[in-house]
């Protein structure tokens, strides 16, 4: 059997390090007996068998010059085996962060903090922690570790699935190449690292008969539970065309009525959402919808969203105060948001 | 010879913009993660952000999380720093350094001063 | 973020003399801890990394100790040049911080 422990990596390769003693091994003969190394395709010998160091050659200080192809030979002139070396230096920690667009399940990714120039592989586990003692703020690792399952096609994302939202878990990525390994563990909790995916399917419609009113509505992400146990608040934002800066209302469910929009003109909104009880942080915005209010005079029929009574809107004069905002109340099935919310809107 | 050289720094008044450069030279730019650090006059040193070799990670100071903007080109061994919305607190001599492990900070640039002031 | 405490932030010793500082860290960083040296306008340089590694380069009479949250930096026996302001850094974490720092001059 060879006296060369096999390095992770591809057969036949050895490593070193950049500015280190380097110590190569022939892998074809027995432990001890002393080779002959050359370079390969170079007929100078670099070090003979009266070496006194026996099977191996050390290289003194390597560095890029000496990567390349090895050869040793026995004292009959036998073939003992050839060796690339390969440098590069040992792992760094990784950058670790996490993410979780909903309540059950998160994601991590890596990068490595530093390129090492040799082949590498992560190893990701995590582990579930517990509060040590019912009045006790300790926490310590209890369950697990089990395997973070990596994406396919080696993306740098592990994902945890079945999270529960109110433990904290503590994520290992191990960065693992032929000179040693190199741990971050990262502690996460699910509430502190929630961020939806934006709200989706954004529409903003002309109210008929309203010329300063932009009627917007949404549905829930797609990546949110269908059966949730954590609702989602939203926040709107609109404003005319060539108009700088964003009016911001937080809308009761998935539809908003903008009540002083400008006549006449286009009106971009977008959206975002957030866990109920401000869990994490806001998604980023959905991508902008645009709208513009209605000119003609309110239809006979009741529009089938709610309920307005049917005189025309008076746009308010300069000096007289603006209609009130309708009020929006959701649906008192507030558990089941898949339903339209019921939007009752009534004008003095 | 192995050197950071930071450019960029300069007097501004509240509210407007600058954008540091970091000029790398003498080892491989590309494998390595990068910083900015700064110190404000006659104080301390203070971690601003870190930015892996890639580029796809990236990590900011409370400070100046959502002003501050870290990037690099790697085919130029640059690095960056766009400050926008600059306030008085961020007047300081800000370097630039190379961490081993993310944050072993083992070459430091000499530095460039932002003033910011009306 | 986690914290890091100096002590003391200021002394004055003779040349000669071994010098000590302390620096404690708000929660447990294992050994990644460094200590800077930093000369009046110049920019930091590292002296000790993972709480107690010379970098190449480094007089022996600086040495470091410690892990977990209290740390200790040591110059055996202060020069003249060793005048400056020491700086311990946590890298436990991904923002890493600085201590206070502790200025050194020479009585």
């Known amino acids: 059997s060879s006296p060369c422990p096999q390095a992770w990596g591809p057969p036949g390769v050895q490593y070193g390090q950049p500015g280190r003693s380097v110590k190569l091994c022939c892998p074809g003969v027995t432990a001890g007996d002393p080779v002959s190394w050359f370079r390969d395709g170079e007929p100078k010998l670099l070090q003979g068998p009266d070496s006194g160091l026996g099977h191996e050659l050390v290289l003194a200080q390597a560095d890029s010059t000496d990567e390349g192809t090895y050869i040793c030979q026995t004292l009959d002139g036998a073939l003992g085996g050839t060796v690339t070396l390969q440098l590069g230096y040992p792992p760094a920690r990784p950058v670790v962060s996490c993410q979780a667009a909903d309540y059950e399940n998160f994601s991590c990714t890596w990068s490595p903090s530093q390129i090492s120039g040799l082949p590498t592989r992560y190893l990701t586990s995590y582990r579930k922690k517990t509060v040590l003692g019912a009045d006790s703020q300790r926490r310590s690792p209890s369950t697990g570790p089990w395997p973070c399952p990596q994406d396919p096609l080696g993306a740098a994302r592990c994902v945890v699935h079945g999270a529960e939202f109110w433990s904290q878990y503590r994520i290992n990525v191990t960065e693992v190449n032929p000179l040693g390994a190199s741990t971050r563990l990262l502690d996460v909790s699910l509430q502190s690292i929630l961020r939806p995916d934006p709200p989706q399917g954004l529409r903003v419609e002309s109210v008929p008969g309203y010329p300063r009113r932009l009627r917007a509505s949404w549905t829930y992400p797609a990546s949110w539970p269908c059966q949730p146990h954590f609702l989602l608040k939203f926040r709107l934002q609109y404003r005319p065309a060539q108009h700088p800066a964003w009016s911001t209302v937080e809308p009761a469910g998935l539809e908003e009525v903008i009540t002083d929009a400008v006549a006449g003109l286009p009106h971009a909104v977008r959206v975002s959402a957030r866990d109920f009880l401000d869990a994490g942080t806001w998604s980023t915005w959905s991508p902008e919808a645009w709208g513009t209010p209605s000119t003609g005079t309110i239809p006979k029929e009741i529009p089938a969203w709610g309920q307005l009574h049917t005189q025309p809107e008076v746009e308010p004069q300069v000096d007289s105060p603006a209609p009130p905002r309708p009020s929006l109340q959701p649906h008192p099935r507030l558990l089941d948001h898949r339903d339209s919310v019921e939007q009752v809107a009534v004008l003095a | 010879e192995v050197q950071l050289l930071e450019s960029g720094g300069g007097l501004v008044q509240p509210g407007g913009s600058l954008r540091l450069s970091c000029a790398a030279s003498?080892?491989?730019?590309?494998?390595?993660?990068m910083t900015w650090v700064r110190q404000a006059p006659g104080k301390g040193l203070e971690w601003v952000s870190s930015?892996?070799?890639?580029?796809?990670?990236?990590q900011y100071a409370d400070s100046v999380k959502g002003r501050f903007t870290i990037s690099r080109d790697n085919s130029k061994n640059t690095l960056y720093l766009q400050m926008n919305s600059l306030r008085a607190e961020d007047t300081a001599v800000y370097y630039c350094?190379?961490?081993?492990?993310?944050?072993?900070?083992?070459?430091w640039g000499r530095g460039t001063l932002v003033t910011v002031s009306s | 973020d986690i914290q890091m405490t100096q002590s003391p932030s200021s002394l004055s010793a003779s040349v000669g003399d071994r010098v000590t500082i302390t620096c404690q860290a708000s929660q447990d960083i294992n050994n990644y801890l460094n200590w800077y040296q930093q000369k009046p306008g110049k920019a930091p340089k590292l002296l000790i990394y993972d709480a107690s590694n010379l970098q190449t380069g480094v007089p022996s009479r600086f040495s470091g100790s410690g892990s977990g949250t209290d740390f200790t930096f040591t110059i055996s026996s202060l020069q003249p040049e060793d005048i400056a302001t020491y700086y311990c850094q946590q890298y436990d974490n991904l923002s890493p911080t600085f201590g206070p720092g502790t200025k050194v001059d020479i009585k």
């Open positions: 930015i892996v070799p890639s580029g796809g990670h990236t």
């Open positions: 003498g080892f491989t730019f590309s494998w390595y993660s």
């Open positions: 350094a190379k961490p081993l492990d993310w944050g072993l900070f083992d070459l």
